[in-house]
């Protein structure tokens, strides 16, 4: 199974200090992965290469994303990417890419969380994306 | 074979101007790769996807890591990641990720070297890690 | 098929506001991919993991690369990497890595474009490279 996703939108819930991205498939092979709004549901357990990139346009001193999984009654951070940002708005433009190999369980929900309220993201599909490759 | 490693600790030997990370397996499939202190020994020769991320909290003007291999009487750099760092300690927080596909030989020892003495690293397993996927 | 490429040189054509890299193979397995000067020709259609890193030594406020494909009468950006750069030449040293999974067609030409005239790149094979893995 292979899935490459691109953004639909990004939102911060009221009173939330995080921003989440809603995803749609751009490339899909196999039935083992299912985009579900702000998350991706794992249908086939196994070892996956996960990758995530977010394009930030924000002068907050550091920006980044956390890729986490929720399932079997617990939430767990898998990996994160962190980027220091310039304080000048014209210069504050950085993509942050990270990836890793993880064992995912059936029913796990994977999501990308930016731990900032109303983070300024560029939701171009070339700059912000999320992907899975079953190994 | 698949191996995803996370840090145990990082040290600079006396009189050394480099910092090395000691690794432990977080995910392992197959017997082709063996964590050995500061290095990973290749048991099965072949083509591997290697990935490395280090999370830096250091105001040194540029930081980064080198992934190198030692074996068969030679030592060489495979790839490196470089990140310019802000001079203010509160802002100096950057992950540096890189990856590539390389042919590794039986007996090769792979290691991650930060070419700075006593580099200030964040050894969280979500921010600093090393991985191998046999293709 | 697997292909890992390293730079031969990088050039900006007269009156062009982009810099392109010319590539040579460092590792090749299979016949599905062919280095062709500034591009890589896809011989075997399929789903590929593509990765790109460029090492920048440039004080231009933001630098980065675009990985694009040309084929079937159209040009398309697949993904890009963006890095804000310090204004001081001694600090302006950043690698920019990105990757993703894409469906490539037979005859597609893949290239790495830096959308700056005469971009200052470090063409070390350890810092600037391009790769493909057929999944």
């Amino acid at each position: 199974s292979v899935l490459h996703l691109v953004p639909i939108n990004a939102t911060s819930k009221d009173d939330s200090d995080v921003t989440e991205v809603m995803w749609q498939p751009a490339l899909r092979r196999g039935r083992g992965l299912q985009a579900q709004g702000y998350g991706v549901r794992i249908q086939d357990a196994g070892v996956y290469l996960l990758y995530s990139q977010v394009l930030f346009q924000d002068v907050t001193f550091t920006m980044g994303q956390v890729v986490s999984r929720e399932g079997q009654g617990r939430q767990e951070t898998l990996f994160r990417c962190i980027r220091s940002m310039p304080s000048h708005p014209d210069r504050a433009y950085n993509s942050c890419y990270s990836a890793g190999v993880f064992h995912l369980h059936q029913g796990d929900i994977l999501s990308v969380i930016i731990p900032r309220a109303r983070a300024k993201l560029n939701l171009s599909p070339h700059g912000t994306f999320l992907g899975f490759v079953k190994l | 074979s698949v191996l995803h490693l996370v840090p145990i600790n990082a040290t600079s030997k006396d009189d050394s101007d480099v910092t090395e990370v000691m690794w432990q397996p977080a995910l392992r499939r197959g017997r082709g790769l063996q964590a050995q202190g500061y290095g990973v020994r290749i048991q099965d020769a072949g083509v591997y996807l290697l990935y490395s991320q280090v999370l830096f909290q250091d105001v040194t003007f540029t930081m980064g890591q080198v992934v190198s291999r030692e074996g068969q009487g030679r030592q060489e750099t495979l790839f490196r990641c470089i990140r310019s760092m802000p001079s203010h300690p509160d802002r100096a927080y950057n992950s540096c990720y890189s990856a590539g596909v390389f042919h590794l030989h039986q007996g090769d020892i792979l290691s991650v070297i930060i070419p700075r003495a006593r580099a200030k690293l964040n050894l969280s397993p979500h921010g600093t890690f090393l991985g191998f996927v046999k293709l | 098929s697997v292909l890992h490429l390293v730079p031969i040189n990088a050039t900006s054509k007269d009156d062009s506001d982009v810099t392109e890299v010319m590539w040579q193979p460092a590792l090749r397995r299979g016949r599905g991919l062919q280095a062709q000067g500034y591009g890589v020709r896809i011989q075997d259609a399929g789903v590929y993991l593509l990765y790109s890193q460029v090492l920048f030594q440039d004080v231009t406020f933001t630098m980065g690369q675009v990985v694009s494909r040309e084929g079937q009468g159209r040009q398309e950006t697949l993904f890009r990497c963006i890095r804000s750069m310090p204004s001081h030449p001694d600090r302006a040293y950043n690698s920019c890595y990105s990757a993703g999974v894409f469906h490539l067609h037979q005859g597609d030409i893949l290239s790495v474009i830096i959308p700056r005239a005469r971009a200052k790149l470090n063409l070390s094979p350890h810092g600037t490279f391009l790769g493909f893995v057929k999944l």
Epitope: - | V18, V66, G73, Q75, T77, H103, P115 | -
Partner: antibody
Framework: QVQLVQSGAEVKKPGSSVKVSCKAS????????IHWVRQAPGQGLEWMGW????????NYAQKFQGRVTITADKSTSTAYMELSSLRSEDTAVYFC?????????????WGQGTLVTVSS | EIVMTQSPATLSVSPGERATLSCRAS??????????LHWYQQKPGQAPRLLIY???TRATGIPARFSGSGSRTEFTLTISSLQSEDFAVYYC?????????FGGGTKVEIK
């Protein structure tokens, strides 16, 4: 562009030592091993050993073990080869060479050579 | 150690002719599909220059008239049409096993 520039010719007495330098420029010095190769007059090429400047790791050919010392100064991007207990058969041109790592596995750049003459 | 043997020791060729140089290793210099065999050119008073690496890949700036072939223990350097600047000594070298070793060289001279 990549350059390796070596120190000048030396004349030495038997039993003494010689230290030859090799200054690298045009690339990241710590990323590549520097090797030393010598060539006696009218003879072929003989490999002596290498240093990986990033870590200071070294490897010497068995023939020269105990007599050769290869070092590197990262601050000046310079490698050094010192050969001790010199004898007349050590008269040769000594070359430093950069090893092109995984993508060539060969000596892709060479210094111009340093002639060392051992004579009483 | 791996012993590299080059033949002939001297090759006399006229300009424009083809030259074929041989290099034999005492044991295989192939490792996991990679051929750790390289060719260098050396002119009098100069350092060697890399021509061919990994048995068959031309180094940057090397003309297409130079080509390399072979595997395991038998390798060949071919110069398709000798130019005046090609008259020199050619060395093969293996980097599969420590210590790295060179062949004794083939001198290509004008006939």
């Amino acid at each position: 562009q990549v350059q390796l520039v070596q120190s000048g010719a030396e004349v030495k007495k038997p039993g003494s030592s010689v230290k030859v330098s090799c200054k690298a420029s045009g690339y990241t010095f710590t990323d590549y091993t520097i090797h030393w190769v010598r060539q006696a007059p009218g003879q072929g090429l003989e490999w002596m050993g290498w240093i990986y400047p990033l870590r200071g790791s070294i490897n010497y050919a068995q023939k020269f073990q105990g007599r050769v010392t290869i070092t590197a100064d990262k601050s000046t991007s310079t490698a050094y080869m010192e050969l001790s207990s010199l004898r007349s058969e050590d008269t040769a041109v000594y070359f430093c060479a950069r090893h092109g790592a995984y993508y060539s596995n060969a000596f892709d750049y060479w210094g111009q050579g340093t002639l060392v003459t051992v004579s009483s | 150690e791996i012993v590299m043997t080059q033949s002939p020791a001297t090759l006399s060729v006229s300009p424009g002719e083809r030259a074929t140089l041989s290099c034999r290793a005492s044991e295989s210099v192939d490792n996991d599909g990679i051929r750790f065999l390289h060719w260098y050119q050396q002119k009098p008073g100069q350092a060697p220059r890399l021509l061919i690496y990994r048995a068959s890949t031309r180094a940057t700036g090397i003309p297409a008239r130079f080509s390399g072939s072979g595997s395991r223990t038998e390798f060949t350097l071919t110069i398709s049409s000798l130019q005046s600047e090609d008259f020199a000594v050619y060395y093969c070298q293996q980097s599969n096993k420590d210590p790295y070793t060179f062949g004794g060289g083939t001198k290509v001279e004008i006939k």
